[in-house]
């Protein structure tokens, strides 16, 4: 399951890179699979929010990103994820790359990477 999620993630990152015009030399943070969930590419200064993954969900490869990005002028709409919700994890895209997730998965979602690998 997790190998499949990882493969789907890489596909989604590829599509997002094309949509956003990202390449290897672009400033910002590359999309990544962190062994728990999928993070879309982001520009420096953006905060990306993801919902806690359902551990054994089967991904639809054609699904849209389940993340919302908050930039300077994009605060999302009423359907957006909100850091004030429970079960939401954020990472900031900084000049040094991705920040650590906040909250950490174990505290936000009740599980951590060791479980995802079993």
């Amino acid at each position: 399951i997790f190998k499949k999620e990882q493969a789907m993630c890489l596909e989604k990152i590829q599509r997002a890179n094309e949509l956003m015009g990202f390449n290897d030399s672009s400033p910002g943070c590359p999309g990544m699979w962190d062994n728990i969930t999928c993070w879309k590419p982001a520009h420096v200064g953006e905060m990306v929010l993801v919902s806690c993954p359902e551990l054994f969900r089967i991904f639809n490869p054609d699904q849209v990103w389940e993340t919302e990005t908050i930039g300077e002028s994009d605060f999302g709409d009423s359907n957006s994820l909100d850091l004030s919700d429970m079960g939401v994890v954020s990472r900031n895209c900084t000049e040094d790359g991705w920040s650590e997730p906040f909250p950490h998965y174990f505290d936000a979602c009740g599980f951590d990477e060791y479980e995802s690998e079993t």
């Epitope: 850091l83 004030s84 919700d85 429970m86 079960g87 939401v88 906040f102 909250p103 950490h104 505290d107 936000a108 009740g110 599980f111 951590d112 060791y114 479980e115 690998e117 079993t118």
Partner: antibody
Framework: QVQLQQSGPGLVKPSQTLSLTCAIS??????????WNWIRQSPSRGLEWLGR?????????HYAVSVKSRITINPDTSKSQFSLQLNSVTPEDTAVYYC?????????????WGQGTLVTVSS | DIQMTQSPSSLSASVGDRITITCRAS??????LSWYQQKPGKAPKLLIF???RLQSGIPSRFSGSGSGTDFTLTINSLQPEDFATYFC?????????FGPGTKVDIK
């Protein structure tokens, strides 16, 4: 019914090691759904979370930075218990020490506690 | 570390009163908050988790509310067994931290 029974000395000399044990009944220290925590309480510091251990295919510990260099929490699967060791104690470590089970339902919370052990650090 | 504060530090009330205790976090914690009751010489007892969810076996006169940085524990129709000290605790990031407590005594 989950019960946590604490044991260990109530008096420890400065610079020595504080050792307490928490025996679990009604659950298992190897449960994939729980965490096993130590908390202490003193008039000066109030309630202070010290750390936890848990099993999710392998053992993992999280410790409070304030005690990270001195603390060890170890599970004992054969006896379904877990222990606290706090090295190089000083009188500031005098407190009531509690073990507690952490459970998850939207957030981690401490739903069962041991009876508490007053540990005095004094020569 | 996230700092938790509570107000008031103590309050006097009578049986049947409705009381509210406030807890404030030094940064937003969504609803990753629990409330505990402690009586002298005893361990804390879980009342509320996830900001507002009542722990099994806890009377419905206890309720929690709030999100972000400000939270409230309400006890409707205070009972004799409710005179105790109440603590909030954040669970969004370690080290988990507790409020200093609110002591509820008999007026």
């Amino acid at each position: 019914q989950v019960q946590l029974q604490q044991s260990g000395p109530g008096l420890v000399k400065p610079s020595q090691t504080l050792s307490l044990t928490c025996a679990i009944s009604g659950d298992s220290v190897s449960s994939r759904y729980a965490t096993w925590n130590w908390i202490r309480q003193s008039p000066s510091r109030g309630l202070e979370w010290l750390g936890r251990t848990y099993y999710r295919g392998q053992w993992k510990n999280h410790y409070a930075v304030s005690v990270k260099s001195r603390i060890t929490i170890n599970p004992d699967t054969s006896k379904s218990q877990f222990s606290l060791q706090l090295n190089s104690v000083t009188p500031e470590d005098t407190a009531v020490y509690y073990c507690a089970r952490g459970m998850w339902n939207q957030n981690w919370f401490l739903d069962h506690w041991g009876q508490g052990t007053l540990v005095t650090v004094s020569s | 570390d996230i700092q938790m504060t509570q107000s008031p530090s103590s309050l006097s009330a009578s049986v049947g009163d409705r009381i509210t205790i406030t807890c404030r976090a030094s940064q937003p914690i969504s609803r990753y908050l629990s409330w505990y009751q402690q009586k002298p010489g005893k361990a804390p007892k879980l009342l509320i988790f996830a900001g507002q969810r009542l722990q099994s076996g806890i009377p419905s006169r206890f309720s929690g509310s709030g999100s972000g940085t400000d939270f409230t524990l309400t006890i409707n129709s205070l009972q004799p067994e409710d005179f105790a000290t109440y603590f909030c605790q954040q669970a969004i990031s370690i080290p988990y931290t507790f409020g200093p407590g609110t002591k509820v005594d008999i007026k």
